[in-house]
Amino acid sequence: GSERTCCPVNWVEHERSCYWFSRSGKAWADADNYCRLEDAHLVVVTSWEEQKFVQHHIGPVNTWMGLHDQNGPWKWVDGTDYETGFKNWRPEQPDDWYGHGLGGGEDCAHFTDDGRWNDDVCQRPYRWVCETELDKASQEPPLL
């Protein structure tokens, strides 16, 4: 595909990436799919600086990111290494809480009202953020 050199309309450029901030809610999988069809992925937070940028744009609203443990270990959707990477969990999170009564635990990560992360039931209809990198070849699907 051709190289993307500027962000699409209604996307926000920051540090050679483009970000799109939803104003409606979807389950994590539908948000993930939405971003894939944008030739993008749910946001992957790799630094404190990127955390502050995203937090500034989403405000105090629960918002999905591209981090989940639906298949066991925590994984970023673009393949970024979780263990060695940036983390910003709330205290005592993630806890894979089963007490919500919705069946199963909590397998998808989101920004909470203060920006720190929590794991939650993936079916909850939260807002989401898509991210795509500038200078990458377009129309290459992100890694699962």
């Epitope: 699409p8 309309v9 996307w11 999988a29 799919n33 939405y34 894939r36 069809l37 030739d39 898509c130």
Partner: antibody, heavy 115, light 107 residues
């Protein structure tokens, strides 16, 4: 209830143009990716073009790239496909489809390219 | 592009039979897969989305399973109205791609 209704098909000569429309209702149009899919007589389903939920991604099949243009009007809940430089091999039934979450299809509109 | 390989391309079955159609993706598509039924001269109709979720109004004799690269559509007890063509479709990423189809015919 999700409804998709295509229109604009017809008989056109090679090299001619047509604009297909797809009127959508029953869902938040701007929140979903949409696609055009076609089916030539006696053949399988072939994706033609799509537009992402934000409108920022509008990819095309190689067979129509440079000739077809997808667009949408959110105020009218309508998806469009502008087809230029039509060829005989573009003859097909063209379907509009909502492709994320529960998948929905329109009834289709027939495009015949013939002299 | 993601290739979708569907098998068999056709099958003959009797009313009441259990029918299974398989679809394989050339790369991991998570569960972003739909199964579509099409009868001659009619528009496609979605049966299953998200690999295993039944579309509203579709009878429960249809079921889907799988994740990643391997998927299955099962019709638990074939009825006369089920004789049609069936396609798998990935919507993990553009370009959307379809399997070649399976034509289910009366034995």
């Amino acid at each position: 209830e999700v409804q998709l209704l295509e229109s604009g098909g017809g008989l056109v000569q090679p090299g001619g143009s047509l604009r297909l429309s797809c009127a959508a209702s029953g869902f938040t149009f701007s929140s979903y990716a949409m696609s055009w899919v076609r089916q030539a007589p006696g053949k399988g389903l072939e994706w033609v073009s799509g537009i992402s939920g934000s409108g920022g991604n509008t990819p095309y099949a190689d067979s129509v790239k440079g000739r077809f243009t997808i667009s949408r009007d959110i105020s009218k809940n309508t998806l469009y496909l502008q087809m230029n430089s039509l060829r005989a091999e573009d003859t097909a039934v063209y379907y509009c489809a909502k492709v994320v979450g529960a998948v929905h299809w329109g009834r289709g509109t027939l495009v015949t390219v013939s002299s | 592009d993601i290739q979708m390989t569907q098998s068999p391309s056709s099958l003959s079955a009797s009313v009441g039979d259990r029918v299974t159609i398989t679809c394989r993706a050339s790369q991991d598509i998570s569960n972003y897969l739909a199964w579509v039924q099409q009868k001659p001269g009619k528009a496609p109709k979605s049966l299953i989305y998200a690999a295993s979720s039944l579309q509203s109004g579709v009878p429960s004799k249809f079921s889907g399973s799988g994740s990643g690269t391997d998927f299955t559509l099962t019709i638990s007890s074939l009825q006369p109205e089920d004789f049609a063509s069936y396609y798998c479709q990935q919507y993990n990423s553009f370009p959307l791609t379809f399997g070649g189809g399976t034509k289910v015919e009366i034995k």
